[in-house]
């Protein structure tokens, strides 16, 4: 999916009013210095890019995020104001159902979790080089 | 918890140049952009410029391009701003800012470095 | 770059009152705004992000509203506490502004 054409500024809002604080909850407990970002991105298309990856596609050691609350208000978010972005995840949505495995809270999910602000804080704030 | 620790007052001659560090703990340092703000005596705040520690990118103030530098030292979780050709305007406090969590805002402040420029 | 004007530049007010303090942008910021408080000597503090959202540790009394080019800073009930300057901040794009300040007094 191109996300090009949504409207960053909703989902912007939509995550400063929920979605960070669903994934402050999920990571509570957590250090602030445990982990560093490894993941980053350029743009905000290529941050949603990147956020859609992380958050809906199961990783070796992680493979629950896509039930978690911020999963399903960042796909809510992405719903309502990506046009066309529900269509291309029913196929999506469908294989998922299939390998649903029980909610496990891992030190990679939450390393992955910790990657996830990181994308949301630089969506937030592209820092576009000085020309 | 998390602290920005600033060096100590400065004073400078007009042309001189400044170098100020704000060394920060208690969160992962590459992780988090820092901004530079400063206040002239009884002044407004003013933006200065962002680094981000990661990459090295800046972006500065236009009104400072040209005389400031900022950079970062990883291994030591230091950021520098280096302010040169230094006027009387100049004198002023300031400021290092880590961005929130959620990068739309500062949570944390250095306690601010003033600087006075006097002949 | 995006100019951001606070009004009043000053303002006196008594324990108990409510009061009032707005931000205007230049230009369209979204909900892209800040407010700080600033006591005398000290650092700013973060009390609102997002235009409307509270701080973690900020007590509920402060609130946010507005988008767009026109937003507000509310204290319903001023504590002794509360006596201090004011400045919003656009956090809609680099190069990042301040408002002008408001200086909250005791009447």
């Known amino acids: 999916y191109d996300f090009t054409n949504c409207d960053f500024e909703k989902i912007k809002a939509a995550y400063l009013s929920t979605i960070s604080k669903d994934l402050i909850t999920y990571m509570s407990g957590t250090k602030s210095t445990e982990f560093n970002n490894t993941v980053s991105c350029s743009n905000r298309p290529h941050c949603l890019t990147e956020i859609q990856s992380l958050t809906f596609n199961p990783t070796a050691g992680c493979a629950s995020l896509a039930k978690e609350m911020f999963a399903m208000k960042t796909k809510a978010a992405l719903a309502i104001w990506c046009p066309g972005y529900s269509e291309t995840q029913i196929n999506a949505t469908q294989a998922m159902k299939k390998r649903r495995k029980r909610k496990v809270t891992t030190n990679k999910c939450l390393e992955q979790v910790s990657q996830l602000q990181g994308l949301w804080r630089r969506f937030n704030r592209p820092l576009l080089k000085q020309q | 918890q998390v602290q920005l620790q600033q060096s100590g007052a400065e004073v400078k001659k007009p042309g001189a140049s400044v170098k100020v560090s704000c060394k920060a703990s208690g969160y992962a340092f590459t992780n988090y952009l820092i901004e530079w703000v400063r206040q002239a005596p009884g002044q407004g705040l003013e933006w200065m410029g962002v680094i981000n520690p990661e990459s090295g990118d800046t972006y500065y103030s236009q009104k400072f391009q040209g005389r400031v530098t900022m950079t970062a030292d990883k291994s030591t979780s230091t950021a520098y701003m280096e302010l040169s050709s230094l006027r009387s305007e100049d004198s002023a406090v300031y400021f290092c800012a880590k961005e929130s969590l959620t990068g739309s805002s500062y949570d944390y402040w250095g306690q601010g470095t003033t600087l006075t420029v006097s002949s | 770059d995006i100019q951001m004007t606070q009004s009043p530049s000053s303002l006196s007010a008594s324990v108990g009152d409510r009061v009032t303090i707005t931000c205007r942008a230049s230009?369209?910021?979204?909900?892209?705004l800040v407010w700080y408080q600033q006591k005398p000597g000290k650092a700013p503090q973060l009390l609102i992000y997002g235009a409307r959202n509270l701080q973690s540790g900020v007590p509920s009394r402060f609130s946010g509203s507005g988008s767009g080019t026109q937003f507000t800073l509310t204290i319903s009930s001023l504590q002794p506490e509360d006596f201090a300057t004011y400045y919003c901040?656009?956090?809609?794009?680099?190069?990042?502004?301040f408002g002008t300040g408001t200086k909250l007094e005791i009447k």
């Open positions: 901040q656009h956090f809609y794009e680099t190069p990042l502004t």
């Open positions: 230009e369209n910021i979204y909900s892209n």
